[in-house]
C-alpha cells in the first residue's frame, strides 16, 4: 500500500522536511503533490512526468519544494503555514490512479527564556515573590528548576498561569537559591540563565565570641560579634551602656579590673530596619579567681535525677580538675565529665553521692581549689524499723516503741493501732499495758518532699502466759562439712530466758555450737550427719515457761565410698553373679554400674545369669547425690574360672 512518512514529523521553523514515499507502484506514468488531504488542482504543488523527467510547478508551488524521481518531496526553509496534510497522486501506465496522504507539524524554534520577578529584595517571613518565565509562547510547556533540581514539594511554592509563574509565599533565607525556568515544545527546549533570589533577613540575635566571660588582669580582650543577616549587619559595641565603636570586633589591650562590666553588641540591618542586641558580662580578676561549684539541681531525688556540677568561672585555655571525698574521680558509669572537664554530671544520684566535691583550676604555677560542697540528695523513706523487736509483753509494763526510716528530709511519723491513728510522733509510749493493748501496731513514715510513704506493721501480744515458742531456721537442708545452720527461737519477748535441748538433753559442749542474741539463736557450724537430731527451744519468765515442738535437722551428706557385696571375687563358670552396691547418703544416691569401663544399668543391684570366663573384668559401682552435688565410686575385680 502506498504510504507517506514525514521525516521529521515535528519540524522546526526554518528547517526542512522530507515527505518520503513508501511502496511506490511499478510502471508509472507520473505523479503530483497537493497541499491538503485531497487532489485539488488549485492546490497542486508540483507534477512530475517520468518519461520526460519533467517537473511542472503548480499553483501552490513556493519555490522551496524539490521533487525526487522516487516521488519523495523535500520542503526547505519551513514556515508555520506549511503545517498540515500533503497528498501524493500517482498515475500508473494503465492510467489507474492511486493516492496517499501524509502530514507534519511546524513549531517555532523557542528563544532562550528569561525570568522576571515582582520583588527583587523580598524580606524574610514577610514578602512573597512571583517569578514569571518570559516570553509567553503558544504550545510551550514551562518547567522550573531550583539549584538545578526539580521543584521541591512545599505548601509555600505555587505554580500558576500554565506553570509559567512560580510564586514563593512567605520567603525564608533558605529560599536563597538559583532559579531557572525552561520552555519546551516538540522541536526545542531552552533554559534561562540563573536568577539568584536575594532574601533580606535578620539580623538574628548576635553571637559574641569567645564565650569566655572571665579574664585575668593584663590579658587582651578581643570580642567578635556575628549575627546572621542579609545584607551583612552593621555592628556597634556598648560597654556598660556607653557607645564605643561601630566595628564587628572590639579589642581592648591589657585589661584591668575596671574593664569588668556588661558588653553589648548591637547588630543593625539597614534594609530590613531591624536591630538585635546581645549582652555578655565580662569579669576581670586581679589574680586567678577562686573557683566555685554551681549545680543545676539543688535537691536531686535519689534514683530519679541527674545532677550537673559546674566549676565556675569559665576561663579559656584552663584545665579543670575534680575531687570527690578528697580523692580524684573514681571510674564509674554514673560519672560523666564534659569535654572541657568543667562540668561533672552524676547520672541517677544515690544517697551515697553526697560528696564532698571540689573543683580546681590549674594555671601555670599552681592549682586553685574551690571550697568543698555537698549534695542534698532527697531519698526515702525506706521501710521503717520498729524497735525494740519484742512482740510479747507482760501486763503492767510500759510499752515504748520507736520508729525510724532512712529519709531526707527526715520522715514524719504516724502510729496506728489496729488501723486507728494514734499520734504523729517518732515514739509511741503506753504505760501500764494490759491484754487490751494487744494488736497490730503500724508505723507510717512519710517524706514531705517526695510525697512517698512506707509502713511497717508489728504484732504486739500482751499476755501473762508466754506463748508456745517455735523454731525458725535459716537453712532447712544444710550440707555436711559445708553449711552452718542458725536456729532462732520465736517470738522475741521482753525479760525472757531462752533454753535449748537436743534429743531431750541440754546442749552438749562443742566448739561447733554457739549461742547468741541472748541465747535466742543457736548456731551449728560445719554441720555433720550426727547433728541430724531433734532440737527444742524453751522460753521462761517469772510467771510461765513453754517449749517448742521439736525440729529435726535434715543434714544432707554423702555419698560415702560405696561397698559392693558379697565380697567374693572368684566365681565358677555357670554360676549367677548378683552384686549389690550400697553408699551412706542423704538423700539416697543414684546408682550406676560399669563393666570394664562400659556403662551398664542404673540400679543398685547388678545381676548376670550363668556367667562364663567372658565375664572376667573390673566391675565399678558409681554413686551420685544430686542434693549435695557429690559423687563417689568403687571398683571390684571379678574372675570366672572354667
Amino acid at each position: 500500500k502506498l504510504t507517506i512518512e514525514s521525516t521529521p514529523f515535528n519540524v522546526a521553523e526554518g528547517k526542512e522536511v522530507l515527505l518520503l514515499v513508501h511502496n511506490l507502484p511499478q510502471h508509472l506514468f507520473g505523479y503530483s503533490w497537493y497541499k491538503g488531504e485531497r487532489v485539488d488542482g488549485n492546490r497542486q504543488i508540483i507534477g512530475y512526468v517520468i518519461g520526460t523527467q519533467q517537473a511542472t510547478p503548480g499553483p501552490a508551488y513556493s519555490g522551496r519544494e524539490i521533487i525526487y524521481p522516487n516521488a519523495s518531496l523535500l520542503i526547505q526553509n519551513i514556515i508555520q503555514n506549511d503545517t498540515g496534510f500533503y497528498t501524493l497522486h500517482v498515475i500508473k501506465s494503465d492510467l489507474v490512479n492511486e493516492e496517499a496522504t501524509g502530514q507534519f507539524r511546524v513549531y517555532p524554534e523557542l528563544p532562550k527564556p528569561s525570568i522576571s520577578s515582582n520583588n527583587s529584595k523580598p524580606v524574610e517571613d514577610k514578602d512573597a515573590v512571583a517569578f514569571t518565565c518570559e516570553p509567553e509562547t503558544q504550545d510551550a510547556t514551562y518547567l522550573w528548576w531550583v539549584n538545578n533540581q526539580s521543584l521541591p514539594v512545599s505548601p509555600r511554592l505555587q505554580l500558576s498561569n500554565g506553570n509559567r509563574t512560580l510564586t514563593l509565599f512567605n520567603v525564608t533565607r533558605n529560599d536563597t537559591a538559583s532559579y531557572k525556568c525552561e520552555t519546551q515544545n516538540p522541536v526545542s527546549a531552552r533554559r534561562s540563565d540563573s536568577v539568584i533570589l536575594n532574601v533580606l533577613y535578620g539580623p538574628d540575635a548576635p553571637t559574641i565570641s569567645p564565650l569566655n566571660t572571665s579574664y585575668r588582669s593584663g590579658e587582651n580582650l578581643n570580642l567578635s560579634c556575628h549575627a546572621a543577616s542579609n545584607p551583612p549587619a552593621q555592628y556597634s559595641w556598648f560597654v556598660n551602656g556607653t557607645f564605643q565603636q561601630s566595628t564587628q570586633e572590639l579589642f581592648i589591650p591589657n585589661i584591668t579590673v575596671n574593664n569588668s562590666g556588661s558588653y553589648t553588641c548591637q547588630a543593625h540591618n539597614s534594609d530590613t530596619g531591624l536591630n538585635r542586641t546581645t549582652v555578655t558580662t565580662i569579669t576581670v580578676y586581679a589574680e586567678p579567681p577562686k573557683p566555685f561549684i554551681t549545680s543545676n539541681n539543688s535537691n536531686p531525688v535519689e534514683d530519679e535525677d541527674a545532677v550537673a556540677l559546674t566549676c565556675e568561672p569559665e576561663i579559656q585555655n584552663t584545665t579543670y580538675l575534680w575531687w570527690v571525698n578528697n580523692q580524684s574521680l573514681p571510674v564509674s558509669p554514673r560519672l560523666q565529665l564534659s569535654n572541657d572537664n568543667r562540668t561533672l554530671t552524676l547520672l541517677s544520684v544515690t544517697r551515697n553521692d553526697v560528696g564532698p566535691y571540689e573543683c580546681g583550676i590549674q594555671n601555670e604555677l599552681s592549682v586553685d581549689h574551690s571550697d568543698p560542697v555537698i549534695l542534698n540528695v532527697l531519698y526515702g523513706p525506706d521501710d521503717p524499723t520498729i524497735s525494740p523487736s519484742y512482740t510479747y509483753y507482760r501486763p503492767g509494763v510500759n510499752l515504748s516503741l520507736s520508729c525510724h526510716a532512712a529519709s531526707n528530709p527526715p520522715a514524719q511519723y504516724s502510729w496506728l493501732i489496729d488501723g486507728n491513728i494514734q499520734q504523729h510522733t517518732q515514739e509511741l509510749f503506753i504505760s501500764n499495758i494490759t491484754e487490751k493493748n494487744s494488736g497490730l501496731y503500724t508505723c507510717q513514715a512519710n517524706n514531705s518532699a517526695s510525697g512517698h510513704s512506707r509502713t511497717t506493721v508489728k504484732t504486739i501480744t500482751v499476755s501473762a502466759e508466754l506463748p508456745k515458742p517455735s523454731i525458725s531456721s535459716n537453712n532447712s537442708k544444710p550440707v555436711e562439712d559445708k553449711d552452718a545452720v542458725a536456729f532462732t527461737c520465736e517470738p522475741e519477748a521482753q525479760n525472757t530466758t531462752y533454753l535449748w535441748w537436743v534429743n531431750g538433753q541440754s546442749l552438749p559442749v562443742s566448739p561447733r555450737l554457739q549461742l547468741s542474741n541472748g541465747n535466742r539463736t543457736l548456731t551449728l557450724f560445719n554441720v555433720t550427719r550426727n547433728d541430724a537430731r531433734a532440737y527444742v527451744c524453751g522460753i521462761q519468765n517469772s510467771v510461765s515457761a513453754n517449749r517448742s515442738d521439736p525440729v529435726t535437722l535434715d543434714v544432707l551428706y554423702g555419698p560415702d565410698t560405696p561397698i559392693i557385696s558379697p565380697p567374693d571375687s572368684s566365681y565358677l563358670s555357670g554360676a549367677n553373679l548378683n552384686l549389690s552396691c550400697h553408699s551412706a547418703s542423704n538423700p539416697s544416691p543414684q546408682y550406676s554400674w560399669r563393666i570394664n569401663g562400659i556403662p551398664q544399668q542404673h540400679t543398685q543391684v547388678l545381676f548376670i545369669a550363668k556367667i562364663t570366663p567372658n565375664n572376667n573384668g573390673t566391675y565399678a559401682c558409681f554413686v551420685s547425690n544430686l542434693a549435695t552435688g557429690r559423687n563417689n565410686s568403687i571398683v571390684k575385680s571379678i574372675t570366672v574360672s572354667a
Epitope: N297, V354, G355, Y357, L375, N376, A406, N408, P409
Partner: nanobody, 120 residues
Framework: EVQLVESGGGLVQAGDSLTLTCTSP????????MGWYRQAPGKQRDLVAD?????????NYADFAKGRFTISRDNVKNAVYLQMNNLKPEDTAIYYC????????????WGQGTQVTVSS
C-alpha cells in the same frame, strides 16, 4: 531551705556541764560530716568540733575543746550533740551547728544558735 535548730544552752557556773542538741526538720544529717561552731561577741565564728558522716567514728576538736567537749550523733533521732564539761567563762558564746561544708545550690544558712553563758 535548710533549717537547723540548736537547743540546750543556758546560764551555768564555771565547772558545770551542758549538752547541746542540734536537729533539723528539713535535712537528714546521716550522710554528712557535721560540726559545732561558736561565735563570741565581737569575734568570728570558729569550729568547735566535727564528726564524720554515717556512724560518726571520726571526730576532731579545736584545741580549747580537747578533753572537755564530746561531739556525738544519733542518726535515728537525726540529732548531733555537744557534751560540754568543766565549762569556763571564755566558753561564753552563741553555739551553732551546721554541715561541715556548704550544700551546693543552697545559701549557707545558719540557725538561731543557742546561747551559752558561763559565769565565774
Amino acid at each position: 531551705e535548710v533549717q537547723l535548730v540548736e537547743s540546750g544552752g543556758g546560764l551555768v557556773q564555771a565547772g558545770d556541764s551542758l549538752t547541746l542538741t542540734c536537729t533539723s526538720p528539713t535535712l537528714t544529717f546521716t550522710p554528712y560530716r557535721m560540726g559545732w561552731y561558736r561565735q563570741a561577741p565581737g569575734k568570728q565564728r570558729d569550729l568547735v568540733a566535727d564528726i564524720s558522716g554515717g556512724d560518726g567514728r571520726t571526730t576532731n576538736y579545736a584545741d580549747f575543746a580537747k578533753g572537755r567537749f564530746t561531739i556525738s550523733r544519733d542518726n535515728v533521732k537525726n540529732a548531733v550533740y555537744l557534751q560540754m564539761n568543766n565549762l569556763k567563762p571564755e566558753d561564753t558564746a552563741i553555739y551553732y551547728c551546721n554541715t561541715y561544708v556548704a550544700i551546693v545550690g543552697h545559701a549557707r544558712s545558719w540557725g538561731q544558735g543557742t546561747q551559752v553563758t558561763v559565769s565565774s
